[in-house]
């Protein structure tokens, strides 16, 4: 109700002789600040005096002075909300009730706190989870209802008297709600922890033992089993007997069922701790274990590998890999069920024993076609020799062998003929499925492996074929040796190296690029006239008359080929110059007279010079000299000179006669 002071603190505090107590405390006074505080031990109210009697452990006066003997007890509070107390050291006779007598200006209050001080350090308390199961992490808690700033303590965990390796987390609480020290240890118990003693030991700051609590761990776990076998090595021969015994070394809770497993599968009607196998067969070889279950789950023993020994069974051959490519490596593996494993092997190739091959594997580093065939083997161990199985077939694959290109035509082949070729081979695995030809052309393949070349060219020199299965094998190229008339016949001037000038020595060569057969004849002609039959046509001193269109012919047994016409050009200085007059050599004055300088020249005249009868050059340089109007004084002999790049030529004199016109005669 509203007439009460409000206090908060632990109801009871625990300690032991020589330790200390720290009492966390808060309060709220009804009015104003605290003026007086007395700490009583076992206070009793005296009705007569209306005061409390009892041992005064602590007293604060209004002036704040504290008697020196009160050092053991300390008021750590304040005047309005904190009432924390400390007693250090605490004694056995401090047990009982502490009374906090609080007075403000107008109000008074007595607050009681229980103090329990034991003679010796009291033990902590171990708290365990309700169930502990193997391999499941649990937290073990050690709780001590004590904590005091002036008296450090520690809690240590021990397993079977040995400090536990796992790290514990220690926490303390010194609050108005609770005072304790707690240590929490997380660990994953194993089945072997079952029944083991765990101790939480209370120690002082120096590690000196103060007290402890102990528990024996109850760890629920699946049955832990041991399997025993007779004979101990678990190796028997067919027909022998075997006994296996399952021992439960630990189970918590008790086991409920027993079963036996072979290769992970439960054996029917085997539900006792002993498994008797009489007259075993090789099929009973395998991994055996016993399984015992309890409420936690099934426990399994380690596996015992029972080996029932027997002679090798008929063998099979495994080939890595078939089909095999010629040149590759191949491994043969002889597979035969046997116990113990075979120690010796005999290998057969097409029924014939392979000498020196006694291992489980046969390795051929470089396979050849003759290695193909049936491989079989026989395995042998200490109990006997197995039978030879059906064997395995090795297929050796290789490209077509000895491929040749064959010409089917009669020889020789002439340009323009139709040529037929075939592609032949000796052997192939797998079979040939296609052919290739080189060079490529727009040729027919009328059937597989046959090539037809229509209108064979002069330049079809060689043809090669390939026969192909998974790989292509090329034949050496075959020469067609096509015969043809001479080709690319042309006239070539050998000398002179520059232009041909009249009088030069001239040689013309009849060239051709090729001819098959090589034996040829030459013919020279000019304007349809045969000039010679040599490869060269020679002129000791060429004359302009030799100029013209020349052709040469080359022929062999296949045919003849003509060159293009070749023009022979002879360069010479102007010659045969003459002056022609128009309209004639007699012209009436006043008319027009044209003198033309005619010449024969190669190259044509590039420059004309005119001369009169006095050999005086006239200021005219063209081929024609036009006199208009012509005068009588123009009468006389004229000559001209022509010049080209080769030289000069001059004409004889030609006389021009200019006569008077009738008018002139009439005037005279």
């Amino acid at each position: 109700d509203s007439s009460k002071w409000v206090f908060e603190h632990p109801e009871t505090l625990y300690a032991w002789e020589g330790a200390c107590v720290w009492i966390p405390c808060t309060y709220r006074a009804l009015d104003g600040d605290l003026e007086s505080f007395i700490l009583f031990h076992n206070p009793e109210y005296n009705k007569n005096t209306s005061k409390f009697d009892g041992t005064r452990l602590y007293e604060s006066t209004k002036d704040g002075k504290v008697p020196s003997e009160q050092k053991r007890v300390q008021f750590l509070g304040d005047k309005n909300k904190n009432c924390t107390l400390s007693i250090h050291p605490v004694h056995l006779n401090d047990s009982g009730q502490l009374g906090l007598r609080m007075e403000s200006k107008t109000e008074k209050w007595m607050e009681r706190i229980h103090l329990n001080v034991s003679e010796r350090p009291f033990p902590p308390h171990i708290q365990l989870p309700p169930e502990i199961q193997e391999s499941q992490e649990v937290t073990l808690t050690c709780l001590l209802n004590f904590s005091c700033y002036g008296y450090p303590i520690q809690l240590q965990w021990l397993l079977e008297g040995v400090p536990m390796r796992q790290a514990a987390v220690t926490s303390t609480s010194l609050t108005i709600k609770s005072v304790f020290t707690r240590s929490e240890l997380k660990f994953s118990p194993q089945w072997s922890h079952h029944g083991k003693i765990v101790t939480c030991q209370l120690q002082d700051a120096d590690g000196k033992f103060l007290s402890n609590d102990t528990v024996q761990l109850n760890v629920k776990h699946t049955p832990k089993l041991e399997i025993k076998v007779t004979p101990s090595d678990a190796i028997v021969r067919e027909g022998d007997s075997v006994t296996m015994t399952c021992e439960v070394s630990s189970s918590n809770p008790e086991y409920t069922t027993v079963s036996w497993l072979k290769d992970g599968t439960s054996l029917k009607k085997q539900n006792t701790f002993t498994l008797n196998l009489r007259e075993v067969t090789k099929d009973q070889s395998g991994k055996y274990c016993c399984q015992v279950s309890n409420d936690v789950g099934p426990g399994r023993s380690e596996e015992v590998f029972l080996q029932v020994q027997y002679a090798p069974e008929p063998s099979t051959v495994q080939i890595l890999h078939s089909p095999a490519v010629e040149g590759s490596q191949v491994e043969f593996l002889c597979m035969s069920l046997a116990n113990p494993l075979p120690t010796n092997y005999t290998w057969y190739h097409n029924g014939k024993e392979m000498q020196g091959r006694t291992e489980e594997k046969v390795h051929i580093p470089k396979i050849l076609p003759w290695h193909a065939g049936t491989y079989s083997c026989v395995a042998e161990n200490i109990l006997g020799t197995g039978q030879r199985g059906p064997g395995a077939e090795l297929d050796v694959q290789y490209p077509p062998k000895k491929v040749t290109t064959v010409i089917q035509n009669p020889m020789p082949i002439r340009e323009g003929d139709t040529v037929t070729l075939s592609c032949n081979y000796n052997s192939s695995n797998p079979s040939v499925t296609r052919y290739e030809w080189k060079p490529h052309g727009a040729w027919e393949e009328p059937s597989l492996g046959v090539l037809k070349i229509q209108n064979v060219g002069w330049d079809n020199t060689t043809i090669a074929c390939a026969a192909c299965n998974s790989w292509c094998s090329w034949a050496s190229p075959v020469a067609l040796n096509v015969q043809y008339a001479p080709r690319d016949v042309r006239v070539r001037k050998i000398k002179p190296l520059s232009e041909i000038h009249s009088g030069n020595s001239v040689s013309l060569q009849c060239d051709f690029s090729s001819s098959h057969p090589k034996e040829v004849q030459f013919f020279w002609e000019k304007n349809g006239r045969l000039l010679g039959k040599e490869s060269q046509l020679n002129f000791d001193s060429i004359s302009p008359e030799d100029a013209g269109s020349y052709s040469c012919w080359v022929n062999n047994s296949i045919g003849q080929t003509a060159s293009k016409a070749w023009t022979l050009e002879v360069l010479y200085a102007p010659r045969r110059l003459r002056v022609s007059m128009s309209p004639g050599d007699q012209v009436m004055e006043g008319k027009s007279a044209t003198l033309t300088c005619e010449s024969d020249a190669n190259p044509p005249v590039s420059h004309y010079t005119w001369f009169d009868w006095n050999n005086q050059s006239l200021p005219y340089h063209s081929q024609k000299l036009r006199l208009e109007p012509v005068k009588v004084q123009h009468s006389g002999a004229y000559w001209c000179q022509g010049t080209n790049s080769v030289g000069k030529g001059r004409s004889p004199l030609s006389t021009l006669t200019v006569y008077y016109s009738p008018e002139t005669i009439g005037r005279r």
């Epitope: 072997s192 101790t199 102990t214 109850n218």
Partner: antibody
């Protein structure tokens, strides 16, 4: 010091039941398991089972599982072993025992005679 | 359960002689957490409860004469009395406490 004090000798008829007590002192009763071991005349020691007084958890030897019952009274720090359907071969000395980390404590033994 | 086999069943020796008796376990009794063998040896005289001689296979219980010693690890253990005295006549039991409890069949020691 640790003491385990057992109840006195018993004579029972076949088919009857017997309950033997074991009073513990000198240690915290709930801290350790209490085991029961018997010894028939001239025979080896034979473990029968244990009880964890902390939570009354029990574990039994399969040979006794159907006939033995272990109980504990925490307030009296006393453990009990009850054996039912008695037969003559149950004639033996019955011991309660407990282990500490480095020692074992045994009761003085209780002689049971089963006779018609 | 773990089976303990003791040998010999009985032996008679003269006082002052050295004597050894064996205990073989069907499984290891070594506890990996503290590397201790959870095997004890007891001496039992007629009409008395077993008296602990050795724990952890080789640690002598306080008050036990030092002529008694234990050895072995895993599955094979030995109790040795270096110089047999008349008061040593008794049956000696081995006891494993790693998993549940089991006892050996005992070895009876007599004085010639």
């Amino acid at each position: 010091q640790v003491q385990l004090v057992q109840s006195g000798a018993e004579v029972k008829k076949p088919g009857a039941s017997v309950k033997v007590s074991c009073k513990a002192s000198g240690y915290t009763f709930t801290s350790y398991w209490l085991h029961w071991v018997r010894q028939a005349p001239g025979q080896r020691l034979e473990w029968m089972g244990y009880i964890n007084p902390r939570n009354d958890y029990t574990e039994y030897n399969q040979n006794f599982k159907d006939r033995v019952t272990l109980t504990a009274d925490k307030s009296a720090s006393t453990a009990y072993m009850e054996l039912s359907s008695l037969r003559s071969e149950d004639t033996a000395v019955y011991y309660c025992a407990r282990r500490d980390i480095t020692t074992f404590y045994w009761g003085q033994g209780t002689t049971l005679t089963v006779s018609s | 359960d773990i089976v303990l086999t003791q040998s010999p069943d009985s032996l008679a020796v003269s006082a002052g002689e050295r004597v050894t008796m064996n205990c073989k376990s069907s499984q290891s009794v070594l506890y990996s957490a503290n590397h201790k063998n959870y095997l004890a040896w007891y001496q039992q005289k007629p009409g008395q409860p077993p008296k602990l001689l050795i724990y952890w296979a080789s640690t002598r219980e306080s008050g036990v004469p030092d002529r008694f010693s234990g050895s072995g690890s895993g599955t094979d253990f030995t109790l040795t009395i270096s110089s047999v005295q008349a008061e040593d006549v008794a049956i000696y039991y081995c006891h494993q406490y790693l998993s549940s409890w089991t006892f050996g069949g005992g070895t009876k020691l007599e004085i010639k």
